[in-house]
């Protein structure tokens, strides 16, 4: 029973002054909380039924109360419409009146928010980005509205998460919960792996060239995943680029110019939810010298009975690293002049009056000398020698 | 919304093995992170397995780890789980979920809860 024994002790003094001590056992019983102080901080759970879109809210009460008006069964008030105040009058035999009155602020529906990844495509290898969106209107409060999310040991109260720095292809798990009131009506909890990050690297191992028109780069490939390589090769200004397969290591290159400074780059790349290139390693080479292009354009010209002016313009692929032009003139195959100049402009004097030459020009680069462009021209008769007429009478 | 089909589902005894069938349609498939869950009789459902969108990454509940093995054939349209030393305690009504992955190698969530439309299941059945 509700009652117990309390034993009160009681000291009086006698007329004679000696001390009485009388003892007398009643039977008390003890005064009940009242609901209201009983039920002062009860808490509640909210959970929402996607297909009639009610609430039902659960009482966190050790025993199976009475809600008055308001039927609850199990502890549970059922049927309640979002955004709408219920008024439940909690009771139990283990208190007295005045009861509880618990104001239920009933959240919004759970299907009015949805967590969306806002996460930016080109950042998804290091950055994981959560946010709630309210995709439909209600009337509650959005005030007392609160977010929370859970990323590993890190906590925060926003709407909104953005995680940073974080480690390409790992693994996240990251919950989250909306508060209503403080109440909890909705949660969700996402497995996050990031993308794939950018590949490393390539470490060049050599890239040279030992022939006029080829040149050779070897490589070791990055350590991170990847799908393919890109080699370019860039000269002046000119840049031309190639697809590799994964599992190459060596690459030849062909038709190059001679005597050109090439500057490679190599960088591997993943095709992710978008493609990521790693670093680029660099390397350059000067390709060998060969024979330079043929002069072209030349012209001979008459300055005199027997004078010639030779010219001609530079070749287009010079190949190498000087620049010295070359003139033979022959007659018959005999080799009478053998000139060079910085320029391609010759003055060819003192030539023999009414004779056939070849002139031939050519580039030389220093190593190679180019095609001749050859042309045939022939010397005057001498126009300002004295012819004497003798007349036979 | 992608429509979801599972297959697969039967009595099987204690140690063996079934694979598990989902057929989705309507949607474009290798966008989805698609993923398992079950329920057993008289227990909330639970998450069992994930799997995203290329097929590349897997996630698992630690009750299935090692046992389990999900995969998936975007060309089918199909996505498996194949489950090998069945317990008892496997014995559940299985589900497989969709859910939109975007950006991430894998973007799945385990809570029920975040998904509005169930299929009918498939019921694995282990008996001891």
């Known amino acids: 029973s509700d009652a117990y024994l309390n034993a009160s002790e009681t000291t009086t003094l006698s007329p004679s002054g000696s001390a009485v001590i009388s003892t007398t056992t009643i039977a008390t019983t003890p005064s009940k909380p009242t609901c209201d102080e009983k039920y002062a901080n009860i808490t509640v759970d909210y959970l929402y039924n996607k297909e009639t879109k009610l609430f039902t809210a659960k009482l966190n009460v050790n025993e199976n109360v009475e809600c008055g008006n308001n039927t609850c069964t199990n502890n549970e008030v059922h049927n309640l419409t979002e955004c709408k105040n219920a008024s439940v009058s909690i009771s139990h035999n283990s208190c007295t009146a005045p009861d509880k009155t618990l104001i239920l602020d009933v959240p919004p529906g759970v299907e009015k928010f949805q967590l969306h990844d806002c996460t930016q495509v080109e950042k998804a290898d290091t950055t994981i980005c959560l946010k709630w969106k309210n995709i439909e209107t209600f009337t509650c409060d959005t005030q007392n509205i609160t977010y929370r999310f859970q990323c590993g040991n890190m906590i925060f109260d926003n709407k909104e998460i953005k995680l940073e720095n974080l480690e390409p292809e790992h693994e996240y798990k990251c919950d989250s919960e909306i508060l209503y009131n403080n109440h909890k009506f909705t949660n969700a909890s996402k497995i996050i792996k990031t993308d794939f990050g950018s590949p490393g690297e390539p470490q060049i191992i050599f890239c040279r060239s030992e022939a006029a028109h080829q040149g050779v780069i070897t490589w070791n490939p990055p350590q991170r995943s990847f799908h393919n390589f890109t080699l370019c090769y860039i000269k002046e200004t000119e840049k031309d680029c190639l697809n590799l397969d994964k599992n190459l290591i060596k690459y030849d290159l062909q038709n190059l110019k001679p005597y050109t400074k090439y500057v490679l780059s190599l960088h591997a790349y993943i095709i992710a939810k978008v493609q990521r290139n790693g670093s680029a390693a660099m390397c350059h080479f000067t390709t060998k010298s060969a024979p330079p292009s043929q002069v072209w354009n030349m012209t001979v010209s008459m300055t005199s009975d027997n004078s010639m002016h030779v010219k001609c313009r530079p070749p287009r692929d010079r190949n190498g690293p000087h620049e010295r032009y070359h003139l033979e003139v022959e007659a018959g195959n005999t080799l009478v002049r053998n000139e060079s100049h910085k320029n391609c402009d010759f003055r060819v004097k003192d030539l023999q009056y009414s004779t056939d030459y070849t002139f031939k020009a050519y580039f030389h680069n220093g190593d190679y000398p180019g095609e001749p462009f050859i042309l045939h021209h022939s010397t005057s008769y001498n126009s300002k020698a004295h012819h004497h007429h003798h007349h036979h009478h | 919304q992608v429509q979801l089909q599972e297959s697969g589902g039967g009595l099987v005894q204690t140690g063996g093995s079934l694979t598990l069938s989902c057929v989705a349609s309507g949607g474009t498939f290798s966008s989805y992170a698609m993923g398992w869950f079950r329920q057993a009789p008289g227990k909330e459902r639970e998450f069992v397995a994930a799997i995203g969108g290329s097929g590349d990454s897997t996630y698992y509940a630690d009750s299935v780890k090692g046992r389990f093995t999900i995969s998936r054939d975007n060309a089918k349209n199909s996505v498996y789980l194949q489950m090998n030393s069945l317990k008892p305690e496997d014995t559940a009504v299985y589900y497989c979920?969709?859910?939109?992955?975007?950006?991430?190698?894998?973007?799945?969530?385990?809570?029920?809860?975040?998904?509005?439309?169930w299929g009918q299941g498939t019921l694995v059945t282990v008996s001891s």
């Open positions: 979920q969709a859910d939109p992955t975007m950006f991430h190698k894998l973007y799945y969530g385990i809570n029920p809860n975040e998904y509005d439309y």
